[in-house]
């Protein structure tokens, strides 16, 4: 008998990221004795929900349902069945639906009440849908990263647990990139916050953190795009629009109302004498990125320094770990290497964009077309929003690192959610209880 | 649906206390503040505060405060205004109604039916 | 607080006709934090326009919101039997108020 695996004791929470363009599941584990350590919570599982995010079931919500029956079910075998009832099941909508309930927060709050009834139909500890804001979803960011990263731990390690950590105790900041919104938090250096809307304060595990941080609804990679087609058919002469952001050879129809269809096109929305127009690629990074930098207002700025469009940002400090999209497009692309600088990045993005699209498709076979077409304007709006938007220079781009996992666990907002939202991140540093971080006894 | 059902009609003395509750169904309890407004017979619509049922924090009209107390029971999803000190023009129908997700804007979507408290010696 | 004030007290009008109904607010208002209810005797009230000018799901389009900053207006633009019912604005800044109402009576 003494020999028989005692039953594991362990919790599980489970954390939804309805974003722009999809919804993904993700199931955390952690032991129930360790709830206030730092460091011990661990994602074991991630489920993509097949289809585009719940903000495009606005006129289908009865769809909804079926949506998320797959990864919802995925959580029910991976979650062993005595642990149901107690797993918390938390959604969070991001940007996508920022955008829906400022077109109509009837429609948002519908699309919510359906996901809500479906949710509750699981045997888990259902806790509620709601869309975060984007001080949430760059501060819980933020966490996640650094709390993974072993920084939040007073025990400084002589080794590293990861390839880009640094043994000091500093922070990371945080540069999330999704469909629709991007955020950057970080904590800087003995700069006062001058704009309290972006100004957050912190107590966790007995230290004290004045963080910075931003969310630039509509400049996420898909509505910047769209942003950028809004601004450029303006001046277009006919219903083609000659686009340097994708590649050689490229051809798309795009719909005059799927357009202007989101708020984010709004500043750029006229009368066009056309329905329709075609995008034609040219495939020219200069100019892409010249396209994208007329996206930035610059001219105006009521603080000491901005980003863009008057936002208040403090000179960047430390390094910083870019994750979501700015990791994936750049692991496709292949340039998420810490050896790899911003001069080589560049040079690369020039020789991605003038591949002609029939070389591109034939090189990328496995890839769908509708996400490998937009790799070259996705890369460029990346350089462009990270040197010119947030004023990275070609030094401090070494100490941006592309993010996709951290010992297993995705980098993004989802597991500081959860951390918070289940107390596990207590205020004051834990009593460590005796031998229970001892190596040796 | 969604479906707001107040407690029946009271009859109270000044000075009394009166308890109205407010069970909620058809969507997710704890989502949704819900708001309290009476109605004086033959008069307009006043409001008396609101509650938040996910973690129970309240804000009362100011001319209210003192008086009035929200409360809720997430396990029956029932909401609770309790007013005190009653006098003769709190005589009123008393209704609760369901107002906006957090984030959202400050209207009030569906309404209970309503319940008469009269405050008489 | 915002005090809202909503004129005329009564307006005396036939099936069939428009109904302009104005709700002044004491102090600027967001658009997105004004409403408009409906309410008749012996009934709760009902939302019917929200953000000064989004109707709410299952109303009629003859029901139109407009106005901002101080003034706004409820249109209804051909008076149904069902429409004559008494009409309050209401505004959100901290607290919610509502105005003293419109009563939209048959002729």
């Known amino acids: 008998t003494q020999n028989k695996a005692l039953p594991e004791n362990v919790k599980y929470g489970i954390v939804l990221d309805a974003g722009s363009s999809h919804t993904s599941l993700y199931i955390y584990k952690w032991p129930a004795e360790k709830e206030n350590d730092t460091g011990v919570v661990h994602q074991v599982e991630e489920c993509r929900v097949k289809g585009p995010g719940i903000s495009k079931f606005v006129q289908k919500v009865d769809e909804i349902g079926i949506y998320l029956t797959d990864c919802m079910e995925r959580a029910r075998e991976v979650i062993p069945r005595s642990q149901h009832q107690e797993t918390p099941v938390y959604l969070g909508a991001t940007a996508g639906m920022r955008l829906l309930r400022m077109e109509s927060e009837e429609l948002a709050d519908r699309v919510l009440d359906v996901v809500e009834t479906s949710l509750s139909n699981y045997p888990f500890d259902f806790q509620g849908a709601r869309i975060i804001t984007g001080q949430e979803e760059g501060a819980y960011g933020w966490i996640t990263i650094n709390y993974l990263l072993g920084k939040f731990s007073q025990k400084t390690r002589w080794f590293s647990i990861v390839p880009y950590e640094t043994n000091n105790q500093e922070t990371f900041g945080a540069l999330d990139l999704g469909g629709a919104s991007t955020q950057v938090t970080f904590v800087p250096q003995n700069q006062t916050i001058e704009s309290p809307d972006n100004a957050l304060q912190f107590r966790l595990y007995g230290k004290d953190y004045n963080v910075y941080t931003h969310s630039f609804l509509c400049y996420g990679k898909d509505q910047a795009l769209w942003q950028k087609l809004a601004k450029d058919i303006q001046v277009a002469s006919n219903e083609i629009l000659r686009d340097p952001c994708f590649h050689p050879g490229y051809k798309k129809v795009v719909n005059v109302s799927d357009l202007y269809k989101t708020p984010c096109t709004k500043r750029f929305e006229m009368t066009l004498p056309f329905q329709q127009f075609e995008i034609q690629g040219i495939g020219n990074y200069q100019q892409c990125h010249q396209s994208i930098l007329e996206l930035f207002n610059t001219s105006y700025c009521p603080y000491s320094q901005c980003a863009f469009n008057g936002i208040f940002l403090p000179p960047l400090q430390g390094d910083f770990g870019a994750f979501s999209a700015f990791y994936f497009v750049m692991k496709f692309l292949n340039l998420t290497s810490e050896k790899v600088s911003q001069e080589k990045v560049t040079e690369m993005m020039k020789k991605f964009c003038a591949q002609p699209w029939e070389e591109i498709k034939t090189s990328y076979a496995g890839v769908k077309e509708k996400y490998l077409s937009e790799y070259c304007f996705s890369g460029t709006y990346i350089l462009s929003l990270l040197l010119q938007g947030y004023h990275f220079t070609a030094d401090s781009w070494e100490h941006i690192h592309f993010i996709g996992k951290i010992q297993g666990s995705d980098a993004g907002w989802t597991l500081g959610y959860m951390l918070n939202l289940t107390n596990m991140i207590p205020a004051e540093q834990p009593l460590s209880t005796p031998l229970s971080h001892s190596t040796y006894v | 649906q969604v479906q707001l059902v107040q407690s029946g009609a009271e009859v109270k003395k000044p000075g009394a206390s009166v308890k109205v509750s407010c069970k909620a169904s058809g969507y997710t309890f704890k989502s949704y503040e819900m708001h309290w407004v009476r109605q004086a017979p033959g008069q307009g619509l006043e409001w008396m505060g609101r509650i938040n049922p996910s973690v129970g924090s309240t804000w009362y009209a100011q001319k209210f405060q003192g008086r009035v107390t929200m409360t809720r029971d997430t396990s029956t999803s029932t909401v609770y205004m309790e007013l005190s000190s009653l006098r003769s023009e709190d005589t009123a129908v008393y209704y609760c109604?369901?107002?906006?997700?957090?984030?959202?804007?400050?209207?009030?979507?569906?309404w209970g039916q309503g319940t008469l408290v009269t405050v008489s010696s | 607080e915002i005090v809202l004030t909503q004129s005329p007290g009564t307006l005396s009008l036939s099936p069939g006709e428009r109904a302009t109904l104005s709700c002044r607010a004491s102090q600027s208002v967001a658009s997105s934090y004004l409403a408009w209810y409906q309410q008749k005797p012996g009934q709760a009230p009902r939302l019917l326009i929200y953000?000064?000018?989004n109707r709410h799901t299952g109303i009629p389009d003859r029901f139109s919101g407009s106005g901002s900053g101080t003034d706004f207006t409820l249109t209804i633009s051909r008076l149904e039997p069902e429409d004559f019912a008494v009409y309050y604005c209401q505004q959100y800044h901290n607290a919610i108020t509502f105005g003293g109402g419109t009563k939209v009576e048959i002729k």
């Open positions: 953000g000064a000018s």
């Open positions: 109604a369901r107002g906006k997700r957090e984030g959202g804007t400050e209207y009030l979507r569906k």
